[in-house]
Structures are given as structure tokens and as C-alpha cells.
Amino acid sequence: HNTTVFQGVAGQSLQVSCPYDSMKHWGRRKAWCRQLGEKGPCQRVVSTHNLWLLSFLRRWNGSTAITDDTLGGTLTITLRNLQPHDAGLYQCQSLHGSEADTLRKVLVEVLADPLDHRDAGDLWFPGESESFEDAHVEHSISRSLLEGEIPFPPTS
């Protein structure tokens, strides 16, 4: 799986979209999880409704919401009031039994609010961020991670 980068501005909302084959994943619930380390497990943040026929209902866990257009084949995750600690690698997943298929790997980048003059030293900016795909969704910019680009910030 390639990794798609979604950039959002601190304090604003970021929408992440994960397209999928609606027929292949028919009847399957979806989830959004956060990758813990490069080889670590993916920790569930939020999942769609327990009843697949109600997957379109927005479900929240804290500041993260998920909704699934099961006919159109698009899972949408909203990160409200984006914070620096939200930056990192995530996955959109399709669930079946105790198994989970990865629909998309997502790198969330948090950019400083240009109107916020406080110290931006705690914001993490990855190295390569000049080349963008033109996928713009509500304060978000997405692109594919460049080959060789590290999806995790270096640890000091």
C-alpha cells in the first residue's frame, strides 16, 4: 500500500477520504486506526456503526468522526480541532470477523496556523512537502508519500 499524505492546519478540521470497492467490501464495517511505531500494531480510534445498514451515521470518538458511504464506496474520517499530536501514520480498515484489510495508509501532517503567532516549535513538518496531488477536501491537501520518504518523525 502506498501512503497518502493529508495535510491540515492546527485548530481546524481535516477530512480524510478512503475510497474502496463497494462490492468487494459489501456488508463490512470500517475502522480508522493509528499506527503505533513503524512495525507496531494499529490502535483502533473509531469504527463505523455496529449495524452495517447504518454505516452512514456519523460516529464520534473524542474529536474524531467516521462515516461510510457504503453504496458509493468512500469512507470519510474527520479530525476536528487538529492538534500537533494528531500527526502520524493511520490506516483506513475494512473489518471482517477478527481480521482487518487495509483500505489506505494515511500520513496526517499538521501545519501551523498562519494566523497563530505562538511558537510553532512543537509542530512536526516532514522533509518533502513540495509535491502535492490536487486533492483538496475541507482544509486538507493529500498526496502520495514520495519513495524513500519516512512516514514517522525521527526520534531524538
Partner: antibody, heavy 126, light 106 residues
Framework: EVQLVESGGGLVQPGRSLRLSCTAS????????MSWFRQAPGKGLEWVGF??????????EYTASVKGRFTISRDGSKSIAYLQMNSLKTEDTAVYYC?????????????????WGQGTLVTVSS | DIQMTQSPSSLSASVGDRVTITCQAS??????LNWYQQKPGKAPKLLIY???NLETGVPSRFSGSGSGTDFTFTISSLQPEDIATYYC????????FGGGTKVEIK
């Protein structure tokens, strides 16, 4: 007039089967999610399960206590929803209602049930 | 699973009184809550959907409010025809009903 009429209830022995029907009229049946509920004598309401509209390929969902025993199906040509009940238990004794899910658009609905049938009594007893 | 606690389980009020019923969810259910009226021997009738929306054709004396875990159903002026049992129903987790509130006339 929008209407739902249930039929097929009656007395049945434990372990046996029964099929309930819910005949719809006055609306485009294929466009709606149809649900079954039950109410044991003197008790509250319990959701049994539902079946998606034609757009959702008649996908079904059930409450845990009936999963594997009850099956919901639909026949669009006759505007009928069915509840096939197998391996019946005494605790399945109840009035069974079918109901229509409220529809917002072609794809979106809400599990607020805006049209109900009159109910049919199922008694499971030896 | 989410538990829906409805209170009171029964109440007696006079015609013209303001009647309030509450429904408490064991966890946050946003506004995913409906209210129904059931008269003896009859099927339930939808009154309020999505916590506060009045169903078409339902008298305006009925109203609903709340979000998160605490919800309220109000009859602003009780009428003789309102004698019934009222149920809340959540759909955040599965489809679960409260235990019901039986409303009687004093």
C-alpha cells in the same frame, strides 16, 4: 393510504417454525428499509431485525438473541416482507410488528419507524 | 451495549398539565434518539425523531430535546387522548428501547 398488515401468527410448539408476512401498500416498497419488532405480553418493545431497501440489496441485520434462528426476506414484486422464525423458544412469545424505516433520500434513511402494522401474536407453548 | 434508562416508569397528571419524561443513555449517543407513543392494544406511533424533530402530523404539544446522554420528552398540555405508554429508542449502537413510561390521567 400507507399501510402495513401482518399475518401468520398463531400457536406453535417449542422447536418448531413459523413464517410471518407483512404486506405493504400505498408506498414504493423497494425504496424502504423494513424492520421487525416484538413485544412480549406486558413488556416493552424489542427490535428483532431489519432488511435493507433494494439499493442495499436487501442486506439484513438482526438482534443477537435471534441471529441464526430468524431470517428476514422481502419480495418486491408482491410488496411483502417476511420473518421466518425457526427453532422457536417460549421466550419468543410476543406480538410481532413490522415497521417502515423513515427515508431521507435514495441512499439515506433513519431508524425512526414511521409506519407500523397492527401486529400479530405468536405464542410458543407446548 | 447501550442501556436506556427511562423515568419515571409511570406518572399521573391532570388534563392541561405539562408532562416531562426523561431518557438517559449509558454513553453518548449524539442525537440518535426517537420517541414513540403506544396506546393499549395498538402499535407504536412515531412522535419525535433525531431527538427533537416532530414527525409530520403529530400535534405541536409534543416536543423533544437533549443530546449526548440526557434527553427529555415533553407534553406541554396533557390531553385525554395522550393516555398511553411512551418509549425512547436509541440507534447509536444498535436499536434499543427504554423501559417505557405509562401516562395516566388523575
Amino acid at each position: 393510504e400507507v399501510q402495513l398488515v401482518e399475518s401468520g401468527g398463531g400457536l406453535v410448539q417449542p422447536g418448531r417454525s413459523l413464517r410471518l408476512s407483512c404486506t405493504a401498500s400505498g408506498f414504493t416498497f423497494d425504496d424502504y428499509t423494513m424492520s421487525w419488532f416484538r413485544q412480549a405480553p406486558g413488556k416493552g418493545l424489542e427490535w428483532v431485525g431489519f432488511i435493507g431497501s433494494k439499493a442495499y440489496s436487501a442486506t439484513t441485520e438482526y438482534t443477537a438473541s435471534v441471529k441464526g434462528r430468524f431470517t428476514i426476506s422481502r419480495d418486491g414484486s408482491k410488496s411483502i416482507a417476511y420473518l421466518q422464525m425457526n427453532s422457536l423458544k417460549t421466550e419468543d412469545t410476543a406480538v410481532y410488528y413490522c415497521a417502515r424505516g423513515k427515508r431521507y433520500s435514495y441512499t439515506y434513511w433513519t431508524p425512526a419507524f414511521d409506519v407500523w402494522g397492527q401486529g400479530t401474536l405468536v405464542t410458543v407453548s407446548s | 451495549d447501550i442501556q436506556m434508562t427511562q423515568s419515571p416508569s409511570s406518572l399521573s397528571a391532570s388534563v392541561g398539565d405539562r408532562v416531562t419524561i426523561t431518557c438517559q443513555a449509558s454513553q453518548d449517543i449524539t442525537n440518535y434518539l426517537n420517541w414513540y407513543q403506544q396506546k393499549p392494544g395498538k402499535a407504536p406511533k412515531l412522535l419525535i425523531y433525531d431527538a427533537s424533530n416532530l414527525e409530520t402530523g403529530v400535534p405541536s404539544r409534543f416536543s423533544g430535546s437533549g443530546s449526548g446522554t440526557d434527553f427529555t420528552f415533553t407534553i406541554s398540555s396533557l390531553q385525554p387522548e395522550d393516555i398511553a405508554t411512551y418509549y425512547c429508542q436509541e440507534y447509536d449502537s444498535y436499536i434499543t428501547f427504554g423501559g417505557g413510561t405509562k401516562v395516566e390521567i388523575k
